[in-house]
C-alpha cells in the first residue's frame, strides 16, 4: 500500500537465514546480518544505473 516498512535492527544469530526488513534505500546483507545501503544495479557497458525497480531480480550480464 506504499507504506514504508520499518527498519528492524535487532541482533540475529549467525545461523539466522531470515532477512531483516529494511527501508526502501536499503537491503539485507547476509554477510553482516543487517540492513545496509543498497544501490540500484549498474549496467557494465554503459556505467549508468538501470531502471531496475525495487523487488525486481537482477539478471547476469552476458560476456562475449
Amino acid at each position: 500500500m506504499g507504506a514504508r516498512r520499518l527498519r528492524v535492527r535487532s541482533q540475529r544469530s549467525r545461523d539466522s537465514s531470515v532477512p531483516t526488513q529494511c527501508n526502501q534505500t536499503e537491503c539485507f546483507d547476509p554477510l553482516v546480518r543487517n540492513c545496509v545501503s543498497c544501490e540500484l544495479f549498474h549496467t557494465p557497458d554503459t556505467g549508468h544505473t538501470s531502471s531496475l525497480e525495487p523487488g525486481t531480480a537482477l539478471q547476469p550480464q552476458e560476456g562475449s
Epitope: 537491503c27 539485507f28 554477510l31 553482516v32 543498497c38 544501490e39 540500484l40 523487488g55
Partner: antibody, heavy 125, light 107 residues
C-alpha cells in the same frame, strides 16, 4: 571519486601494537561495511575483520580474535584497526576495502568494490 | 568456516586463449561469490560479483557462472594485461573467505 587510503603501517617488535587507519572519501562509511584484508609476502588474501559503522557491529577472523579491534569514526569518515600482541605471522600488507551492495529482491548482491593501496606491517625483532 | 578451493593453483596460457578457473565451496553459498584480479604490488580489483554479474568497467571477456558450491571464472580471449592472480571469495556468511588464488602466467 571513491577513495580509501590506509596509513599506520611499519616495523614493530613481536608483542607490540600498531593502529592502522583507513580514510575514506567520495562516500560515507556509515552506508557500507568496511573490511580489512591482509596479504602475507608471497601469499594469498586473508580477510581480517569487518565493521558496519552505522551500528558498530563487527566480526573477526579467528586468527586475530582477541588481539585486533576494528572501529570507525563516522565524523572523520575513517575506519581503524587496532592491532595488539602482534606476532611474526601478522606480517603482511593490510588493505581496507568497501563492500558495495546491489539490491536483488531486497537482499544484497555485493562484493568489495573499492580497495586502498595497502600498508605494510612488519613484525620482527 | 566455509572453505573455498580454487583450481588450478597456476596455469600457463597464451594471448587469445580461453582460460577457465574453478572455485568450490565447502558448503552451499547460493550465488554469493565474487572474483578479483590482483597484479604484483597492487590491490585486488573486483571483476565479478554475485557469481555472474560483471562489475562496472570490467571487459566483457570476463564472465562468471555457478551457484551452490561450484563456480567458474572464464576469460574468453586472454589479453596481455590479464596475466595476474585471480581469487574467488564467498560472502554468504561471515567470515568471508577467499580461495588460495590462481596465477595466470605467460606460456
Amino acid at each position: 571519486e571513491v577513495q580509501l587510503v590506509e596509513s599506520g603501517g611499519g616495523l614493530v617488535q613481536p608483542g607490540g601494537s600498531l593502529r592502522l587507519s583507513c580514510a575514506a572519501s567520495g562516500f560515507t562509511i556509515s552506508s557500507n561495511s568496511i573490511h580489512w584484508v591482509r596479504q602475507a609476502p608471497g601469499k594469498g588474501l586473508e580477510w581480517v575483520a569487518w565493521i558496519t559503522p552505522s551500528d558498530g557491529n563487527t566480526d573477526y577472523a579467528d586468527s586475530v580474535k582477541g588481539r585486533f579491534t576494528i572501529s570507525a569514526d563516522t565524523s572523520k569518515n575513517t575506519a581503524y584497526l587496532q592491532m595488539n600482541s602482534l606476532r611474526a605471522e601478522d606480517t603482511a600488507v593490510y588493505y581496507c576495502a568497501r563492500r558495495v551492495c546491489y539490491n536483488n529482491l531486497g537482499v544484497c548482491a555485493g562484493a568489495m568494490d573499492y580497495w586502498g593501496q595497502g600498508t605494510l606491517v612488519t613484525v620482527s625483532s | 568456516d566455509i572453505q573455498m578451493t580454487q583450481s588450478p593453483s597456476s596455469l600457463s596460457a597464451s594471448v587469445g586463449d580461453r582460460v577457465t578457473i574453478t572455485c568450490r565451496a565447502s558448503q552451499d553459498v547460493s550465488t554469493a561469490v565474487a572474483w578479483y584480479q590482483q597484479k604484483p604490488g597492487k590491490a585486488p580489483k573486483l571483476l565479478i560479483y554475485s557469481a555472474s554479474f560483471l562489475y562496472s568497467g570490467v571487459p566483457s571477456r570476463f564472465s562468471g557462472s555457478g551457484s551452490g558450491t561450484d563456480f567458474t571464472l572464464t576469460i574468453s580471449s586472454l589479453q596481455p594485461e590479464d596475466f595476474a592472480t585471480y581469487y574467488c571469495q564467498q560472502t554468504s556468511t561471515s567470515p568471508p573467505t577467499f580461495g588460495q588464488g590462481t596465477k595466470v602466467e605467460i606460456k
